[in-house]
Each structure stands twice: as C-alpha cells, then as structure tokens.
C-alpha cells in the first residue's frame, strides 16, 4: 500500500514539475527590466528564451521572436537546450511511469518489469529536474554577471544622479517557476526510485524440503538450519511440485509409509 502511494505521489509530483518546466520554458519573463534607479519611462522591457517584449504603461505589449539562430549568445542556446532536454526526458519518463504504476494492470506484466520501469522513469525525472535547474541557474548567473557589469559602468547624469550606461535586468518570474518545477520533478523522481525498491520482488525463498530415500527409516529435515540461520522467512509454504521431495509442512500433515517403521 505504501509503495503504491509513494509511486502515485511521485508520479503526480513529477507531472506537476514537468508541466512547470514546460510553462517556464514558454514564458517570456526570464529577465525583466530592473526599475530601481531607472529613469522613469513609459515602457517596460522583458525577455524570454524565444522572444523579447516591450510593454507600454497602458498595458499594450509588443513582442518579437529571436529569428536569427547564429547571432544568439551561446549561453542562451545552452539554456534552451537544457530546458528542451529536460522536457523531452520528463515526457518520456511520464509515459514510462504510467505503465509502471502499480494500480494499472497491463496484461500479465510482472512486478519485476514494473519495478524496472519505475526505476527508469525515476532516473529520467531526476535528470529532467537537474536539466531544468541547471538551465535556469545558468541564465540566472548570466543575469547577475551582466547586472554587475552594467553597474560597474556607471556615470553621473543630470542633477548628479548616478545612472548606468546600459539597462539592467533582473530575475523574471520564469526563473522562479523553473527552479520550483525542477525541484518538484527531482523530488518526484526520487520518490519513484524509492517506490521501485518496494516493488522489486524479494529473492526467491527456497522451501525446506524432506528428502525420502526408500529403505531408510529417518527423514532428513533441514528445518533446524532454516530456523537457526534466519533464512526462509516465508511462512506460507506452498506446494510447488509433487515428487520425492515435499515441503516440511506437507510431511507433518500427511504421514507417509516411510515415516514410521
């Protein structure tokens, strides 16, 4: 029950996380114009991974995509790549995890197969979350570097007011969405990996058997060994096959002609 809950919760958390990563990747507000110590303007600038926007004080907004691919900064391309890889891995992970869910029966899929699929999806979610966190962090680092570079290039403007030569940009909403989403995907992945351990079937418990050799009056029962060593924790001894060897319980329940002289 706990395994099913852990797996289900891991799936839901990862699903929310990946939805967040997609949302962050599509959002325009990765960097927003820093309004602190800025000359009062009627316009506000903000940029995303795919386009840049200008918003008027009236609310009217105009956006333009980055049409050139070669002219874009390498860092921006790297962030785009990390986010896309994160989305793709997350989407594949979700697909795999749907079939791995314990509450869903697909044909005669064994628990070992479900455990493997759960582990695979968990690893995919972890990598997906890490990609998103890395992408957002690289972009944030780029913003911080540019912010302090523009701050260093200051000049004294009219009225003795200190101004920057370039407009400074600060963290946009997409960065926070990306960090949270990446974290959720990562947590979901860890939960899936934990659930996998519970799904994996334990090693086969070999039943204690009585070997009956005709002509001998004493049956060899290795039950004492089982009890003393702690092996064979399985209490439900099921009848596996009929033959010369029988389970301990069977021998005790059904005496044979070899048991007594």
């Amino acid at each position: 029950m706990a395994v099913t809950a852990c797996q289900g919760l891991g799936f839901v958390v990862s699903l929310i996380g990946i939805a967040g990563i997609i949302a962050a990747t599509c959002m325009d507000q990765w960097s927003t114009q820093d309004l602190y110590n800025n000359p009062v303007t009627a316009v506000f600038n903000y940029q995303g991974l795919w386009r840049s926007c200008v918003r008027e004080s009236s609310g009217f907004t105009e956006c333009r995509g980055y049409f050139t691919l070669l002219g874009l900064p390498a860092m921006l391309q790297a962030v785009r790549a990390l986010m896309i890889v994160g989305i793709v891995l997350g989407a594949i992970g979700l697909l795999v995890s749907i079939f791995a869910l314990k509450c869903i029966r697909i044909g005669s899929m064994e628990d070992s197969a479900k455990a493997n699929m759960t582990l695979t999806s968990g690893i995919m979610f972890i990598v997906s979350g890490l990609c998103a966190i890395a992408g957002v962090s690289v972009f944030a680092n780029m913003l911080v570097t540019n912010f302090w570079m523009s701050t260093a290039n200051m000049y004294t403007g009219m009225g003795g007011m200190v101004q920057t030569v370039q407009t400074r940009y600060t963290f946009g909403a997409a960065l926070f969405v990306g960090w949270v989403a990446g974290g959720l995907t990562l947590i979901g992945g860890v939960m899936m990996c934990i659930a996998c351990r519970g799904l994996a079937p334990e090693e086969t418990n070999y039943k204690a058997v009585s070997y009956h050799a005709s002509g001998h009056s004493v049956a060899y029962k290795p039950g004492g060994f089982k009890a003393s060593t702690g092996f064979g924790s399985n209490t439900k001894n099921k009848k596996i096959y009929d033959g010369g060897a029988r389970t301990e319980d069977e021998v005790q329940s059904y005496p044979s002609k070899h048991d007594y002289v």
């Epitope: 303007t41 316009v43 600038n45 940029q47 200008v54 290039n153 030569v165 407009t167």
Partner: nanobody, 123 residues
Framework: QVQLVESGGGLVQPGGSLRLSCAAS????????MGWFRQAPGKGLEFVAG????????DYADSVKGRFTIARDNAKNTLYLQMNSLRAEDAAVYYC????????????????WGQGTQVTVSS
C-alpha cells in the same frame, strides 16, 4: 549588421519644422527597435524618441513630447523623426540608433549607430 545613414538636418528658425530620415541598409530593419538620440555641443548623448519593431509602441523624452513624432516604414527600411515647434535648445547632432531586443533610453543598449545629422535652430 545594419548600417544607418541619417539625412534631413539643416538650419531652421525657432518654431519651425524639420523631418529627419534614417535609412537602413539591412533588409532585417523590421527586426530592430529604433531610436533617435541627440548630442548638443559640450553635452552628453540624450535620448529623444524610440519605437518598437512594428511601431506599436513609441517612447519620447519629456522635453520633446507633443512636439516630435517618431515613425517607421519597414517596407522602405526607413525611420523618421518629425520635429515641430523647434526651439533653440533642440539644436544638436541627431543620431539614429538600432538594437534588437529593448526599447530603452540608455545609449549603451543600442548596438548600431549612424554618423549623425546636424540640426541648427537659429533666428
């Protein structure tokens, strides 16, 4: 990279009008935010007006608001600045500038610049 050439400057009387043009060499003119800056003798660069890619948003310095109008014709790859009710303090070298992603009043944000055109306001 885009090359910008200004024209239309000259001598004008106070209260007069003048229309500046800025021709861009690049056919990707529509993918640039454009701006006009001016520099009076012994002064720094001052933002005059700016316009977004398709001309939907325009920004003006308080000193020129209501007197100057910025416009662009993407089909002709040309930027315009219509200057009315000119004053003596409007006399300066006017520069056309371009940048790809932001409409700002800071000269450091503009990557491409023209050589400038002189505007003299005198009676």
């Amino acid at each position: 990279q885009v090359q910008l050439v200004e024209s239309g400057g000259g001598l004008v009387q106070p209260g007069g009008s003048l229309r500046l043009s800025c021709a861009a060499s690049d056919s990707t003119f529509s993918s640039y935010i454009m701006g006009w800056f001016r520099q009076a003798p012994g002064k720094g660069l001052e933002f005059v007006a700016g316009i977004t890619w398709s001309g939907g948003i325009k920004d003006y310095a308080d000193s020129v608001k209501g007197r100057f109008t910025i416009a662009r014709d993407n089909a002709k790859n040309t930027l315009y600045l219509q200057m009315n009710s000119l004053r003596a303090e409007d006399a300066a070298v006017y520069y056309c500038a371009a940048n790809a992603i932001q409409l700002t009043r800071r000269s450091g944000d503009y990557a491409y610049w023209g050589q400038g055109t002189q505007v003299t306001v005198s009676s």
